[in-house]
């Protein structure tokens, strides 16, 4: 049998059709105990494509070395030279060109606006729920639910400055302390790296490219995770960001100024305010136990009001709620006295979707969730396109040169510091870390940027957010200006501390070192990138939201054990690493415990039995919906069903299973990994419902 | 014009119950709040309690609380107070009066007739 | 409850005299306060509203003044169907009540 799905007799005589490019290069062993284990001999490795009919099928030749997954993949020039046009050709180019560009910018738009739609669908859904989390009176004294109150509520309404404004309106109206805020906002820094990882998932289709993405946005998890896991304590134990912030704040006299510049704003809003508005007070209201806010809708029904201020009779339980004592009276039945009451007329209602449809905020959210994650989906499949045809060759070779270069020696230390301003920068002008790290996802993905070059950008990100809430806090009324300000400060310090501690020394780059580690293995095993996001972001805190209800002694006597098994683990996996020899033989390797508690092989074999009914289907659907995309816009190969379905018939074929015959919309490609290089004993198990 | 009809007297039992009218007319029924207080022969008024037809809502004295029960029938335009376990002490002059609005402070601009209550066996 | 203290129990007055009435509150009940006349086997009938403001179809000898917690009812020049039972009532506070009375007789 081998290696990878032969072509049966789909072309007589294949060599009028293919030029064939094989290397005898031999499988390195430690590669090769990835492949089948029948037959793991040295393989001639080819890589061919079956091209369009209109055009003689040429093989594209490519370096056939098992290099290192995670070095950036050529990306081939296809195109006729630029020399080589007549003027025809050149002015066309020109145009496609434009045309690109205005594709790519459109989809961007999209991307963006659908991301903005996701975060008001995740407070549709979640919202209510998140602001009654912050109505937990236990957060004062317990930091640690805190934090998972700050993750938690961020995952679900999918906004950090939703969750930080929330924060704020509690600190300026006394029922939070700075102290019990600031491990919210820890918690709110970890929550909003959850989107790109999201968006990272969207490019689950191709391994390769799904090491990069889910890697480059899981940079920015382990990042924040790391920096909690040693700043939260070194707070706790010397209160140094509630310090430090608090002497800022005193030695300015501050005057509340203009708002924040809405920059990127400016041109989304028009469009998702035609989608859905949300009143995003009532979160705040529910943090703050307001009961009546309970039964509000977050759907926004009135966009103009006006508010006037009129005096009102109104009932009072007893003369000790009168406003002044002559200003009391009885009808006979109730106490009765005067108050100034804001009256609210409602003039104008909001010109969105939903304004008269009078769902429940759940209806609301799951629809918009489904449709965001679509557009989401669909507009970075399609960035994703573009880019892969736009940075081929020449293009290619500039751009990454110029991103990913560092500085000339002795200045080559500067180039990441001058990616963190990058990143601060670009994120203050898009008003949002998440919509700039989802958008360096994709990037990350084909192998414009490197996971290196990615990692300060991302830390610039997590400053230039901090940057654009100092400058709404500064923006904000004289009552609530020095909280806002304050907390604004710590979230900033504790960036900047986290960047001090895991950058400037490139041992202590920890990060990279782990998103590489997630990227190797969810692209072995795409489920555990699902397994990761459920894990981190939403069991572990509410696991801990939840011992931390019971109070310190379960929280304690349940999470002294699990922290020290951890670090045992972890003193293990070193020596195992380092210097085995000193281990005894037994504990020199994992071999001692089931497979299952060293292993995910066992793990995917389950989960692959589960999502295997649904892999055909799908797959089925997703070749029919391509070839009439391609007939539609009379481009034989503008659209290519996922890796995973391609893996799936391999594995159905090496088992003997008949795949059809190629067809004219059919772009097959046969990439190394087909081939055995990051492949399980049984391809069967390799492709999941992802 | 405003009126408010009460029949002249009532002759009950010690004991019983009895359940006298306020027929209201020359006014909406329905906004306005009606009083209902006690005088006793030579003596002082004492308020008993209120209704307020619109809704039904009723408010009474702590002293009158479990002894007078208060109803209206909007169709009839007609308050009803019922006085129960009546005793001599209870045979006094009932006035029905009508107050102002839902909210408006508590004056009497009318009053009814009164019914005499006679408590005898 | 607050209480009405009326002064005095019962004043004894010829046609054509200056009478004042008094009303005492327990507490403050600004000017929440209202006079009632009652002749002999009547209803009562509303004088003044709000300590000073005369009911239309009252005689314009009638006047009432104060707030907070004393009142006065005047008649500047009593006449004869004038003699009766006079009361104040606060509607202040819950529940309404009313002061004992003052009784006009004919000297």
């Known amino acids: 049998m081998a290696p990878w799905p032969e072509l049966g007799d789909a072309q007589p005589n294949p060599s009028k059709y293919l030029e064939g490019a094989t290397s005898q290069q031999p499988i390195t062993p430690d590669k090769s105990k990835e492949t089948n284990k029948t037959d793991n001999t040295e393989v001639p490795v080819t890589k061919f494509e079956l091209l369009p009919t209109y055009s003689t099928a040429t093989l594209i030749e490519e370096p056939t070395e098992v290099d290192d997954p995670w070095n950036l993949p050529t990306l081939q020039d296809s195109g006729i030279k630029w020399s080589e046009r007549d003027a025809k050709g050149k002015i066309l180019c020109v145009f496609q060109g434009i045309g690109r560009l205005i594709l790519l910018l459109g989809f961007l738009y999209f991307f963006v606006c659908s991301l903005d739609v996701l975060s008001s669908a995740f407070q549709l859904v979640g919202g209510k729920m998140a602001g009654q989390f912050f109505s937990n009176s236990s957060i004062m004294s317990n930091p640690l639910l805190g934090l998972v109150i700050g993750v938690l509520v961020t995952v679900f309404v999918q906004s950090s400055s939703t969750s930080t404004s929330i924060v704020v309106s509690m600190v300026a109206s006394s029922l939070l302390t700075v102290r019990a805020a600031i491990p919210i906002i820890m918690g709110a820094n970890i929550g909003t790296s959850i989107t790109n990882t999201i968006v990272a998932l969207m490019q689950v289709g191709d391994r390769s490219e799904f090491r990069r993405a889910f890697a480059g946005a899981t940079v920015h998890d382990f990042f924040n995770w790391l920096s909690v896991l040693v700043l939260l304590p070194v707070e706790v134990a010397t209160h140094y960001l509630e310090v430090v912030t608090q002497l800022i704040v005193e030695s300015f006299h501050f005057k509340n100024g203009e708002d924040a510049p809405d920059l990127l704003k400016v041109i989304t809003k028009p469009f998702t305010k035609l989608i859905v508005q949300l009143d995003k007070k009532v979160i705040s209201q529910i943090a703050m136990n307001d009961e009546t806010a309970k039964n509000k809708s977050l759907v926004k029904i009135w966009c103009k009001t006006f508010t006037n201020m009129t005096q009102m009779n109104v009932t009072v339980p007893s003369m000790a709620n009168c406003t002044s004592h002559s200003l009391c009276w009885t009808d006979g039945i109730q106490i009765w006295t005067m108050k100034n009451v804001t009256y609210k007329e409602n003039i104008a209602k909001c010109q969105h979707i939903f304004v008269n449809f009078h769902l429940p905020d759940l209806a609301v959210g799951i629809i918009l969730l489904i449709i965001s994650l679509l557009v989401l989906c669909g507009c970075l499949i399609m960035i994703v396109k573009i880019l892969g045809s736009v940075l081929k060759g020449q293009v290619a070779t500039v751009i990454k040169k110029t991103i990913n270069t560092d500085f000339p020696f002795p200045f080559a230390w500067l180039t990441g510091y001058l990616a963190i301003l990058v990143g601060a920068g670009m994120t203050f002008i898009v008003q949002s870390s998440s919509v700039f790290t989802s958008a360096l996802t994709p990037l990350i993905g084909i192998g414009v940027i490197t996971i290196e070059r990615a990692y300060p950008l991302t830390l610039g990100s997590n400053i230039g957010t901090t940057t654009t809430a100092i400058l709404a806090a500064l923006a904000s009324p004289g009552n609530t200006l020095r909280s806002s300000l304050q907390i604004a400060l710590c979230h900033f310090f504790f960036n900047i501390s986290g960047i001090l501690l895991w950058y400037p020394i490139p041992f202590t780059r920890l990060p990279i070192r782990m998103a590489k580690g997630l990227g190797n293995i969810s692209a072995k095993y795409r489920w555990f990138a699902v397994f990761y996001l459920i894990i981190f972001f939403f069991l572990i805190p509410l696991t801990v939201f939840g011992l931390s209800l019971a109070g310190w002694p379960v929280l304690v006597g349940v999470g002294v054990p699990v922290v020290f098994i951890i670090i045992l683990v972890l003193c293990l996996r070193l020596l195992q690493s380092r210097c085995p020899r000193v281990l005894p033989k037994k504990l020199q390797n994992w071999n001692f415990l089931p497979l299952c508690m060293h292993s995910l092989k066992p793990w995917d074999a389950v989960i692959s039995k589960f999502t295997g009914p649904f892999q055909m289907p799908c797959c089925c659907c997703c070749r029919v919906c391509c070839r009439v995309c391609c007939l539609l816009c009379g481009c034989p190969k503008c659209c290519r069903c996922s890796k995973c379905c391609q893996d799936l018939e391999e594995g159905q074929e090496a088992q003997g299973v008949p795949v059809k015959a190629p067809e004219t919309f059919d772009n097959i490609t046969i990439s190394r990994e087909a081939q055995g290089e990051v492949r399980a004993p049984d391809s069967k198990t390799e492709c999941t419902a992802l | 014009q405003v009126q408010l009809q009460q029949p002249g007297a009532e002759v009950v039992k010690p004991g019983a119950s009895v359940k006298m009218s306020c027929k209201a007319s020359g006014y909406t029924f329905t906004s306005y709040i009606i009083h209902w207080v006690k005088q006793a022969p030579g003596q002082g008024l004492e308020w008993i309690g209120a209704?307020?037809?619109?809704?039904?809502?009723?408010s009474y004295s702590q002293r009158f609380k479990g002894k007078a029960k208060l109803t209206a029938d909007k169709s009839s335009s007609t308050a009803y107070m019922q006085l129960n376990s009546l005793t001599s002490e209870d045979s006094v002059v009932y006035y029905c009066a009508r107050g102002n609005n839902y909210g408006s402070p508590a004056w009497f601009g009318y009053w009814g007739q009164g019914t005499l209550v006679t408590v005898s066996a | 409850d607050i209480v009405l203290t009326q002064s005095p129990v019962t004043l004894s007055v010829t046609p054509g005299d200056r009478v004042s009435l008094s009303c005492r509150a327990s507490q403050s009940i600004g000017n929440f306060l209202y006079w009632y006349q009652q002749k002999s086997h009547e209803s009562p009938r509303l004088l003044i509203k709000?300590?000073?403001q005369s009911m239309s179809g009252i005689p314009s000898r009638f006047s009432g003044s104060g707030s907070g917690t004393d009142f006065t009812l005047s008649i500047s020049r009593v006449e004869t169907e004038d003699f009766g039972m006079y009361f104040c009532q606060q509607s202040n506070s819950w529940p309404v009540t009313f002061g004992a009375g003052t009784k006009l007789e004919l000297k």
């Open positions: 709000y300590a000073s």
């Open positions: 209704i307020y037809p619109g809704n039904g809502d009723t």
